[in-house]
């Protein structure tokens, strides 16, 4: 053997090296890789050093027997059957209450003839549950409401007004409060005649009686 080069590097089972025919002079870098379904154990990069020894021991290729961590899903909890996700392991996603699952709830780690084990499906998503709308309220008698819809989405506001000569009693604007079910923040208002309101609240009426034989009114004030 030459005494000015590093020793020859062998091939490794279930893997290969590149370059395949490296120069063995100092400074040469050789990278080992594994076939699909195998992973490198040890250092994959070796370098021929000044003292003509390789920087690391020869690596090996080991069969991959588990799936990668499929990760957390926002707005959910997950139940794991085995912490390292070996073949046969399951991960179950359960959406938090108020969220709806889109996709598969349970993923299973499956072995493959060629390549690494793989999850049965991709991780699902948890989407916000659609909030039910509020049913439209009637316009008050002698009044109007805006907008005039039959259904109002959660969070929407409706406004009430009264016809000329009428005043609003209650809230002029009420909101569809999001919830399960959604509900109106206040009861609908009513429209009262402004003149009567003012009249009855500020005056008292005295009734004058006419004497039987007289046509004149004796009004007392």
């Amino acid at each position: 053997p030459r005494n000015d080069t590093c020793p020859e590097l062998p091939e490794i089972p279930n893997g290969w090296k590149s370059p395949s025919q490296p120069e063995l002079v100092h400074g040469t870098v050789v990278t080992y890789q594994c076939y699909p379904g195998y992973q490198v154990v040890g250092s994959s990069v070796l370098m021929c050093q000044w003292d003509l020894t390789w920087s690391e021991d020869l690596p090996s290729c080991q069969r991959v027997t588990s799936c990668h961590d499929p990760g957390d899903v926002e707005h959910s909890r997950r139940l794991i059957s085995s912490p390292k996700f070996p073949v046969g392991a399951t991960v179950q996603y359960i959406c938090d209450q108020g969220f709806v699952l889109m996709g598969s709830s349970i993923l299973t780690c499956h072995d493959r003839q060629a390549g690494s084990p793989k999850w049965s499906d991709r991780a699902p998503k948890c989407l916000l549950e659609q909030l039910k709308p509020c049913h439209g309220l009637s316009a008050p008698e002698n009044g109007a409401r805006s907008p005039e819809k039959q259904l109002h989405p959660a969070g929407a506001t409706i406004h009430f007004s009264c016809a000329p000569g009428y005043v609003l009693k209650g809230q002029a604007s009420i909101k569809c409060v999001p919830g399960h079910p959604s509900h109106w923040s206040d009861p609908p208002p009513i429209c009262r005649a402004a003149s009567l309101d003012g009249f009855y609240n500020s005056r008292s009426l005295d009734v004058a009686k006419a004497p039987a034989a007289s046509s004149t009114l004796d009004a007392a004030h």
């Epitope: 707005h75 139940l79 059957s81 108020g98 919830g179 399960h180």
Partner: antibody
Framework: EVQLQQSGPELMKPGASVKMSCKAS????????IHWVKQHQGKSLEWIGE????????GYNQKFQGKATMTVDKSSSTAYMELRSLTSEDSAVYYC?????????WGQGTTLTVSS | QIVLTQSPAIMSASPGEKVTMTCSAS?????MHWYQQKSGTSPKRWIY???KLASGVPARFSGSGSGTSYSLTISSMETEDAATYYC????????TFGSVTKLEIK
């Protein structure tokens, strides 16, 4: 009638481990997750974690990760919870509970006392 | 995690009186659940999904609320209603329970 029958009271020394059981009856055991809930004397409730009896999948409250381990035996419709490295803080009543988002059936509770 | 604060911590009511207890969440939740517990017994599911009564719960009980504010109301207090009540959410993991309201009879 749905029933969750829990094992009896336990008196343990600090540093020891304890395993309590919960036998389910009156429904299909694998159809509902089993949860464990802790209640300190006269205090509020704390969720420890849950197990899916069908897959054996578990989920834990981070606070109890490493402290509690939940398992099931499908053949006897029994859920188990082991608590390790016990301290006086672990003295409490432990309930096994059935549920998904709320807890509809509760066991009678297992009282654990940790004392030297 | 979401913190649930119940108020009042302790309250007393006379038979026939209307009772309201509240549960305030540190973040918005979609639903609230309530449990009743009497001394020396396990908690019982009482109200679920904010307003649904569990089977066997008298109609004088009701639940309402949305967002961060929920309440349990008893329209007319009865002796058997004296107990400890807990609210609970699972709109966010881990699920959490409220700090407790103890209802006593006057």
């Amino acid at each position: 009638e749905v029933q969750l029958q829990q094992s009896g009271p336990e008196l343990m020394k600090p540093g020891a481990s304890v395993k309590m059981s919960c036998k389910a009856s009156g429904y299909t055991f694998t159809d509902h997750n089993i949860h464990w809930v802790k209640q300190h004397q006269g205090k509020s409730l704390e969720w420890i974690g849950e197990i899916n009896p069908n897959t054996g999948g578990t989920g834990y409250n981070q606070k109890f990760q490493g402290k509690a381990t939940m398992t099931v035996d499908k053949s006897s419709s029994t859920a188990y919870m082991e608590l390790r490295s016990l301290t006086s803080e672990d003295s409490a009543v432990y309930y096994c509970v059935r549920g998904l988002y709320f807890f509809d059936y509760w066991g009678q509770g297992t009282t654990l006392t940790v004392s030297s | 995690q979401i913190v649930l604060t119940q108020s009042p911590a302790i309250m007393s009511a006379s038979p026939g009186e209307k009772v309201t207890m509240t549960c305030s969440a540190s973040s918005s939740v979609s639903y609230m659940h309530w449990y009743q517990q009497k001394s020396g017994t396990s908690p019982k599911r009482w109200i679920y999904d904010t307003s649904k009564l569990a089977s066997g719960v008298p109609a004088r009980f009701s639940g309402s609320g949305s967002g961060t504010s929920y309440s349990l109301t008893i329209s007319s207090m009865e002796t058997e209603d004296a107990a400890t009540y807990y609210c609970q959410q699972w709109s966010n993991t881990p699920p959490t329970f409220g700090s407790v309201t103890k209802l006593e009879i006057k």
